[in-house]
């Protein structure tokens, strides 16, 4: 039994963190900013042609630990980074594509070049 003065209705968790969103903006976002109770993220992945595409936005608290863990997906090159330390922190994230594995070389010379990307995180 609830104590007097305590609400029985669940209280909505406030959306306290604002994130930059790019290719991943909800309909109610303004000026490419979304709000979340969880994390900001930036993700880079290759599309079907091999072009790197960056998306960024908000992740809800529920399930975000798993999503931010960046579990490798076979035959898909992608990388995600998450942050919560301040509003719009994800504009400073710089995920880079993972290095190619031998089994990714099946598509011919297009995939045989190595990345020269530096993996510094300043």
């Amino acid at each position: 039994k609830k104590e007097d003065g305590e609400s029985t209705a669940p209280t909505a968790r406030p959306k306290v963190l604002r994130c930059k969103c790019h290719h991943h903006c909800p309909e109610d976002s303004v000026n490419n900013i979304c709000s979340t109770d969880g994390y900001c993220f930036t993700m880079i992945e290759e599309d079907d042609s091999g072009t790197p595409v960056v998306t960024s936005g908000c992740l809800g608290l529920e399930g975000s630990d798993f999503q931010c863990r960046d579990t490798p997906i076979p035959h898909q090159r992608r990388s995600i980074e998450c942050c919560t330390e301040r509003n719009e922190c994800n504009k400073d994230l710089h995920p880079t594509l993972p290095p190619l594995k031998d089994r990714d070389f099946v598509d011919g010379p297009i995939h045989h070049k190595h990345h020269h990307h530096h993996h510094h995180h300043h």
Epitope: T42, D47, G50, T51, V54, H94, G108, H115, H117
Partner: antibody
Framework: QIQLVQSGPELKKPGETVKISCKAS????????MNWVKQAPGKGLKWMGW????????AYADDFKGRFAFSLETSASTAYLQINNFKNEDTATYFC????????????WGTGTTVTVSS | SFVMTQTPKFLLVSAGDRVTITCKAS??????VAWYQQKPGQSPKLLIY???NRYTGVPDRFTGSGYGTDFTFTISTVQAEDLAVYFC?????????FGSGTKLEIK
């Protein structure tokens, strides 16, 4: 000597189709990506997209989806850009530009092809 | 798409001067920025890639630096043949975008 030699200038009426060629020499076409870049008169550079020269799969920037098509004739070491239903705003110089695969800076540029609309 | 804000638009300098051009990215680009030179009536030429790497055959008076969102291109001692428009470009994410250009004119 590595070169990208493009076809000559074109004068087109609105609604017509133009096809620009870019012939690669001094390297194997299929070991580098081929990008296309637009430069409108007195303006900056705009990346239109690229074609994966090994698989033949093209990718287009959002502003160039629909009327624009990239293609290859690998036996002739040549890449093509086709513009359908030519419009006034397509008046520009078009460059092909080579990129090391999985790197996206452009180390060799074509000679450029100027396409102008004639009313 | 990501915006590369390039400044200044114009530079009027004397031969022998030092010149600096800046590009500010709308998002962290890491080292993924290149610089190009386009002389009048010519195609662009790659000068710098990965922010600070000089391309083959580029004179050492041309240098690049920066990381993240702030990038700088410098000509240590301008020569008459450096008359051109200079562009930065982010090569991190599609669509790959260019700065608006800096026109370098020699007095």
């Amino acid at each position: 000597q590595i070169q990208l030699v493009q076809s000559g200038p074109e004068l087109k009426k609105p609604g017509e189709t133009v096809k620009i060629s870019c012939k690669a020499s001094g390297y194997t076409l299929t070991t580098y990506g081929m990008n296309w870049v637009k430069q409108a008169p007195g303006k900056g550079l705009k990346w239109m997209g690229w074609i994966n020269t090994y698989s033949g799969v093209p990718a287009y920037a959002d502003d160039f989806k629909g009327r624009f098509a990239f293609s290859l004739e690998t036996s002739a070491s040549t890449a093509y850009l086709q513009i359908n239903n030519f419009k006034n705003e397509d008046t520009a110089t078009y460059f092909c530009a080579r990129s090391e695969l999985r790197n996206w800076y452009f180390d060799v540029w074509g000679t450029g092809t100027t396409v102008t609309v004639s009313s | 798409s990501f915006v590369m804000t390039q400044t200044p638009k114009f530079l009027l300098v004397s031969a022998g001067d030092r010149v600096t051009i800046t590009c500010k990215a709308s998002q962290n680009m890491g080292h993924n920025v290149a610089w190009y030179q386009q002389k009048p009536g010519q195609s662009p030429k790659l000068l710098i890639y990965y922010a600070s790497n000089r391309y083959t055959g580029v004179p050492d008076r041309f240098t690049g630096s920066g990381y993240g969102t702030d990038f700088t291109f410098t000509i240590s001692t301008v020569q008459a043949e450096d008359l051109a428009v200079y562009f930065c470009q982010q090569d991190y994410s599609s669509p790959f975008t260019f700065g608006s250009g800096t026109k370098l004119e020699i007095k």
